[in-house]
Amino acid sequence: AFGISGVQKYTRALHDSSITGISPITEYLASLSTYNDQSITFALEDESYEIYVEDLKKDEKKDKVLLSYYESQHPSNESGDGVDGKMLMVTLSPTKDFWLHANNKEHSVELHKCEKPLPDQAFFVLHNMHSNCVSFECKTDPGVFIGVKDNHLALIKVDSSENLCTENILFKLSET
């Protein structure tokens, strides 16, 4: 297993990272599934969207998410670098005007309706992982990743001293 960059000691750095362009550099429509091939689905209930992690029946259509990629500057002054490294951030939208948001107080992932410019809670650092997987790190809470907990998406703190390739924060993106 080989993937995530370290996450400790970045408490302020990602907060201060700047999205270098207002427009995304590219967009990609994909279905989102867990490392164990469960699908991430979105259901409209009582005028709000719920997010589920579930096994789909054979031939059942997977929900799609629009990933918008943004180039972001990783600031040298906070990380102690003399190098302003660039990284990719994403927003995830399963339906028009709704975006995944990190609710750091509740440690939850929610769908919020909002207008552009999107709030920082809607941006996630994209980590290039092993086995064709990705991980999503909160811009607003470095070291905290979107993960799976009790068949729902949740925010999970990753300690760099542990195995960073923990399966519950690994996701697969697929066009099908």
């Epitope: 960059s5 990783h74 990380s79 290039n128 092993h130 760099s160 195995n163």
Partner: antibody, heavy 119, light 111 residues
Framework: EVQLVESGGGLVQPGGSLRLSCAAS????????MSWVRQAPGKGLELVSA????????YYPDTVKGRFTISRDNSKNTLYLQMGSLRAEDMAVYYC????????????WGQGTTVTVSS | EIVLTQSPATLSLSPGERATLSCRAS??????????MNWFQQKPGQAPRLLIY???NQGSGIPARFSGSGSGTDFTLTISSLEPEDTAVYFC?????????FGQGTKVEIK
């Protein structure tokens, strides 16, 4: 200033051993994946080994598997490459390289240390 | 492993001319909407320096004359107007899958 400084290169006989070190400064070393990349004289670049930020995950290509060991000491901000059973084809400049945040590319490189394998 | 083949091996051009360097991958380096192709410049006696990442995004502090394009298996690094200091070897590198691999390099000479 971000810096990676390699040391430990030198002349070694075939079958011999060598330990390379890479001293990191100017950044939070424990937060980055690191790699060793080598370049044989007049040739291209080859990934020799890689290690996760905590040291828990490592990678080796078949060309060095079982002969080379990558490790790190985050308290000393130092990356190591223990090389054993050295062969003529291991002769190269060895670079220490930092992975970018998010693991997309190599963003910082050392100046390299030369390993010569000859009898 | 993914094999990268660069062409030409050597490019000899005059200052101000446009340089076009190619890199072909043995299989697609695209994944989830991103092309995992990077370009590095290496001057004699120096370590490589990142120019372009994810096929078309400029590294920090890289002059605007360097640009990248392509997707799938075919990629191009363009130097719009060569400067004398661009004399170097240019390498492509894929980060789609481990082992991250490099092309053999294209040497750019300024006449």
């Amino acid at each position: 200033e971000v810096q990676l400084v390699e040391s430990g290169g030198g002349l070694v006989q075939p079958g011999g051993s060598l330990r390379l070190s890479c001293a990191a400064s100017g950044f939070t070393f424990s937060s980055y994946y690191m790699s060793w990349v080598r370049q044989a004289p007049g040739k291209g670049l080859e990934l020799v080994s890689a290690i996760s930020s905590s040291g828990g995950s490592t990678y080796y290509p078949d060309t060095v598997k079982g002969r080379f060991t990558i490790s790190r000491d985050n308290s000393k901000n130092t990356l190591y490459l223990q090389m054993g059973s050295l062969r003529a084809e291991d002769m190269a400049v060895y670079y220490c390289a930092r992975h970018s945040y998010g693991n997309w590319y190599f963003d910082v490189w050392g100046q390299g240390t030369t390993v010569t394998v000859s009898s | 492993e993914i094999v990268l083949t660069q062409s030409p091996a050597t490019l000899s051009l005059s200052p101000g001319e446009r340089a076009t360097l190619s890199c072909r991958a043995s299989e697609s380096v695209d994944n989830y909407g991103i092309s995992f192709m990077n370009w590095f410049q290496q001057k004699p006696g120096q370590a490589p320096r990142l120019l372009i990442y994810a096929a078309s995004n400029q590294g920090s502090g890289i002059p605007a004359r360097f640009s990248g394009s392509g997707s799938g298996t075919d990629f191009t690094l363009t130097i719009s107007s060569l400067e004398p200091e661009d004399t170097a070897v240019y390498f492509c590198q894929q980060s789609k899958e481990v082992p991250w691999t490099f092309g053999q390099g294209t040497k750019v000479e300024i006449k």
